[in-house]
Interface confidence: low
């Protein structure tokens, strides 16, 4: 069968900018790296049939099915999908291979099925079969991981009930504060579900799949650290597991740890202890308090006590539903053109929020930082001194929150003018909103000092561009000023700006701009 062509079938996944629909066989798109689909000869079939590996595509994804044919001479082709013939335009690549493409833009249910490509070359005829199906992402979920104790072992299992099965990793850090950020060299990652080394300073578990990445931190009270000024607070929803770790280091083993809830010792089976010697021969003890599924009555003050350290507490609050607590009243800010300034929102939320900052229909990434008092803060500094409305939006599984900000930039007015046969108008966007004067320039008043008061109509804030106010002033034309130069001036506390307009006949008007500080 040496005269059979060499066939290569590939799948190209396109970056989805979420804006394409349709399909065409006539042109490939801006693309990612191709994935080989094999294209093996199908045994026991009448005629020469090649079968590509099955293709599973996300809803709305854009793909190209492509066949590369290494055969001499010209080729002609035809795509058939659901008994419909589709146009096919082969072209040749730099290696002189025939290239046939089928673009599926924004995959929908109707575009799933068998795509048959019939190719006729000078030597032979053959068929290539692609089977395209939609990946069932409706079932996809990504849940925040939680902890369980490993049966008969002093180890924690990290569980995330997610579809598809997530990759679970432990993120460990042994230093304090800022140096425990994800990218820090102090951070160690272990891609496994079970963790035996539970003595570290900061322990998190993260789960990731196609939907993203979610992390849960092991709540820790460190008796060797100075307590926070405000009591640490842990929120959980009814039914979630509770895990609190109490950690203490002492010069020798002569100390013990205990947990109490509201001054009552925790029941056996709700705690377990581990200990180890550190490199400098000091003893580290950790005592876990855990409840496999919390109820409302598990709310209260959990206190870890030691015979050699001051005790510390945490307030555990069990809620029926998640929440986002913050003040949603809108805030207005007025700053100078070069003043450094950041918007900020302080909030308390459970579960952790996802958030965005939006300005002028553009969304910006949102970073959040935990504060010592149980609150978190999100700041936005990338406003580039553009006045207008800024929106902070946050949501979690159970709640949504939106807060509006208005930014005004103090600057002197800048005037734009336009004129028609019957009136002249001036516009300005300075802040604070400017006041207006109109002056007539004539032989009697070559410096344009003669003020016009009649026929002037001022409109404050006549249009709002993403929160940016624009003020305008209109002069209705009268016989007394026809043919003269008039000057409109806008002024505020930062300066004055003027435009001179020749009031002659309709048509393009010459404007002369004056800037007076």
């Amino acid at each position: 069968n040496q005269d059979l062509p060499v066939i290569k079938c590939v799948l190209i996944n396109h970056k989805n900018n979420d804006s394409s629909v349709g399909k065409s066989s006539s042109y490939p798109m801006v693309s990612e790296s191709p994935e080989d689909l094999g294209c093996a000869l199908r045994p026991q079939s009448s005629g020469t049939v090649y079968e590509a590996a099955a293709v599973e595509v996300d809803v709305s994804a854009s793909i190209t099915l492509q066949v590369l044919v290494d055969a001499p001479g010209n080729i002609s082709c035809l795509w058939v999908f659901k008994h419909s013939s589709l146009n096919c335009q082969p072209h040749f690549d730099l290696q002189n291979r025939g290239v046939v493409s089928m673009v599926i833009l924004k995959m929908t249910e109707t575009q799933a099925g068998e795509y048959l490509l019939f190719i006729q070359s000078e030597a032979t005829n053959y068929t290539i079969l692609f089977t395209v199906s939609i990946r069932n992402t409706l079932l996809y979920t990504l849940r925040r991981p939680y902890f369980r104790k490993m049966e008969n072992q002093d180890a924690l299992v990290c569980i995330s009930e997610s579809v598809p099965e997530p990759i679970v990793e432990w993120v460990l850090c042994d230093s304090q504060g800022e140096s425990c950020k994800e990218e820090s060299p102090a951070v160690v990652k272990k891609e496994e579900k079970v963790l035996h080394e539970l003595f570290g300073t900061d322990i998190r578990c993260c789960a990731r799949n196609e939907l993203g990445r979610e992390c849960t931190r092991l709540f820790t009270i460190d008796l060797n650290q100075t307590p926070q000024t405000t009591l640490p607070q842990l929120f959980l929803k009814v039914g979630e597991p509770l895990w609190i770790r109490c950690k203490a280091v002492h010069v020798n083993h002569g100390f013990g740890l205990t947990w109490e809830l509201e001054n009552k010792a925790l029941e056996e089976g709700n705690y377990f202890e581990m200990s180890t010697y550190s490199t400098n021969r000091t003893m580290i003890r950790i005592l876990f308090a855990f409840v496999s599924s919390v109820a409302r009555n598990d709310t209260g003050y959990y206190t870890c006590s030691s015979s050699k350290h001051p005790s510390q507490s945490a307030l555990v609050t069990i809620v029926e539903k998640g929440f986002i607590n913050a003040t949603n009243s809108s805030e207005d800010y007025e700053i100078d053109q070069y003043e450094e300034f950041c918007f900020s929102v302080r909030f308390k939320a459970y579960p952790q929020i996802r958030c965005t900052w939006t300005f002028s229909r553009k969304s910006f990434p949102c970073e959040q930082k935990g504060l010592d008092n149980g609150y978190s803060i999100s700041k936005f500094c990338n406003h580039k001194h553009q006045p207008g409305e800024y929106i902070f939006h946050a949501e979690n599984d159970d709640a949504q929150f939106t807060k509006m900000f208005t930014l005004n930039i103090r600057r002197k007015p800048q005037v734009l003018a336009e004129a028609s046969a019957s009136q002249a108008s001036c516009f300005s966007d300075g802040y604070p909103l400017p006041s207006w004067t109109w002056k007539k320039c004539s032989d009697k008043s070559p410096n344009c000092t003669e003020e016009i008061t009649e026929g002037v109509w001022n409109r404050k804030a006549n249009r709002k561009v993403f929160g940016q106010w624009v003020s305008s002033s209109t002069l209705n034309m009268s016989e007394a000023i026809k043919g003269f130069l008039v000057k409109c001036c806008a002024y505020n506390s930062l300066g004055t700006s003027c435009e001179t307009i020749l009031l002659n006949s309709p048509g393009p008007f010459p404007f002369i701009q004056d800037n007076i500080s």
Epitope: H14, S19, G22, K23, S24, Y27, L105, T110
Partner: antibody, heavy 120, light 107 residues
């Protein structure tokens, strides 16, 4: 700023060819398809074809097959539409228009149009 | 080729009116439909893409709906600047055909 600038008006004799250019600026030229659409005086819009500036591949409406050629020059971010064997009914304003995303959502950015007059 | 039929071909209305223009495809095109506005001597302007998504910068009085073969463009409260010709275009598969247009005139 993001814009498409087309070449100036042309007057051609029947049987001749015309080549209209469309220069893109303010965005990544190879990331968007370019459509060509024409409009005869007092008539509606007529889609002529599309070109992928990345690879240069094209798709033409059947009506123009064999008479139209769309090309591009990535070094100058310019696409060209050449129409041959002109007849009087080809008198129209020819627009280039950038495809939204790839091409499946219509066209979000249009040139001002180039008037081509075919007259003996 | 997919044929696009717009109706009505012309329409008289007053400022403040609610106006609906319909577009029918000769075969199912999912939501692959765009609406344009064109004023005399100007290039068309994209209003709606993917049948119902409002193009950035277009006033919210414009809205689109429909899927499959039947689509509508609605202007909730006509403004003086809305008097123009409106076109639908299918963007499902080449050739990306246009409807014949609907001329919206002042009553």
């Amino acid at each position: 700023q993001v814009q498409l600038v087309q070449s100036g008006a042309e007057v051609k004799k029947p049987g001749a060819s015309v080549k209209v250019s469309c220069k893109a600026s303010g965005y990544t030229f190879t990331n968007y398809y370019m459509h060509w659409v024409r409009q005869a005086p007092g008539q509606g819009l007529e889609w002529m074809g599309i070109i992928n500036p990345s690879g240069g591949s094209t798709s033409y409406a059947q009506k123009f097959q064999g008479r139209v050629t769309m090309t591009r020059d990535t070094s100058t971010s310019t696409v060209y539409m050449e129409l041959s064997s002109l007849r009087s009914e080809d008198t129209a304003v020819y627009y280039c228009a950038r495809g939204v995303g790839y091409s499946g959502y219509g066209a979000d950015l249009w040139g001002r149009g180039t008037l081509v007059t075919v007259s003996s | 080729d997919i044929q696009m039929t717009q109706s009505p071909s012309s329409l008289s209305a007053s400022v403040g009116d609610r106006v609906t223009i319909t577009c029918r495809a000769s075969q199912g095109i999912s939501n692959s439909l765009a609406w344009y506005q064109q004023k005399p001597g100007k290039a068309p302007k994209l209003l709606i893409y993917a049948a119902s998504s409002l193009q950035s910068g277009v006033p919210s009085r414009f809205s689109g709906s429909g899927s499959g073969t039947d689509f509508t463009l609605t202007i909730s409260s006509l403004q003086p600047e809305d008097f123009a010709t409106y076109y639908c275009q299918q963007s499902h598969s080449p050739p990306y055909t246009f409807g014949q247009g609907t001329k919206l005139e002042i009553k």
